[in-house]
Amino acid sequence: KAMHVAQPAVVLANSRGIASFVCEYASPGKATEVRVTVLRQADSQVTEVCAATYMMGNELTFLDDSICTGTSSGNQVNLTIQGLRAMDTGLYICKVELMYPPPYYMGIGNGTQIYVIDPEPCPDSD
């Protein structure tokens, strides 16, 4: 079943290559287990950036080597992606799945265009 997912259209990462945005979903029921996946679309190709499954009220747990971290509050997930460089500029799409209890719901946002600026090199010092 389809579910509405909202996310900001455009975000500029900070000078350290960190971008945060909220992914909000319109939950039709009382889900206890939610899966959030961040997808990156660039050059017409979609790749998975990171994913986490969490129990409502608990923290999101991404894999140890993931570039993503996040927190949840109600029907909102605050996602942070770090280690970004200019070449990582692209459309980052939030996918939310309500895993348990049934019925299963899934929603995909329109994507957040994340722009990343590589830091300017420091001038050489003598």
């Epitope: 900001p8 259209a9 975000v11 990462a13 660039a42 050059d43 500029t89 329109n110 994507g111 722009y115």
Partner: antibody, heavy 117, light 107 residues
């Protein structure tokens, strides 16, 4: 409908500053960015920089760094662009434009800035 | 920074003509290329985004194509209201950069 309304024309002396406002309506202001673009008489479009309204991060064009400041007031859905130390070659029409995932889709009507002693 | 060039810088054409404007980027910008139309004394207007997608309300006589570094804007049958200046702009990387523009006037 979605629109950006800019402040009126300004006449400034060389060395002075100008602050142009851009009021957004009928969309979620924080979900998009605001770019500032200027156009000198008879010239093309020159991108000055943009502000990510969502988080306040800013990217200025190298040419304007140190002389321009872009800000937003989310309580009034208004963006501002201040340009300091005005020179005669800053005479131009200044536009704000909404930055989306797919280009700058909505533009303000433009603000004419005249620099004259 | 990514540099954008356009050709021709100006052209003269008649109502009903097919017009083609080209835009070239100094490095690959994938499909992140937008086209704007500007009439004298007016703000620019987004015509085409991501190379070939028509902005809402834009007539279907406008079309865009290309990828990588070379892009084209085509007006299949020029109408009186199409006499204007056209700019390409890349949104692949910041700083966003515009082409110098192509002025389309009446022959």
């Amino acid at each position: 409908q979605v629109q950006l309304v800019q402040s009126g024309a300004e006449v400034k002396k060389p060395g002075a500053s100008v602050k142009v406002s851009c009021k957004a309506s009928d969309y979620t202001f924080t979900s998009y960015g605001i770019s500032w673009v200027r156009q000198a008489p008879g010239q093309g479009l020159e991108w000055m920089g943009w502000i990510s309204v969502y988080n306040g991060n800013i990217n200025y064009a190298q040419k304007f760094k140190g002389r321009v400041t872009m800000t937003t007031d989310t309580s009034t859905s208004t963006a501002y662009m201040e340009l300091r130390s005005l020179r005669s070659d800053d005479m131009a029409v200044y536009y704000c434009a909404r930055v989306t995932q797919f280009g700058m889709d909505v533009w303000g009507q433009g603000t004419t800035v005249t620099v004259s002693s | 920074d990514i540099q954008m060039t356009q050709s021709p810088s100006s052209l003269s054409a008649s109502v009903g003509d097919r017009v083609t404007i080209t835009c070239r980027a100094s490095q690959s910008i994938s499909s992140n290329l937008n086209w704007y139309q500007q009439n004298p004394g007016k703000a620019p207007k987004l015509l085409i985004y991501t190379t070939s997608s028509l902005q809402g309300g834009v007539p279907s006589r406008f079309s865009g194509s290309g990828s990588g570094t070379d892009f084209t804007l085509t007006i299949s049958s020029l109408q009186p209201e199409d006499f204007a200046t056209y700019y390409c702009q890349q949104s692949f990387r910041t700083p966003f950069t515009f082409g110098p523009g192509t002025k389309v006037d009446i022959k």
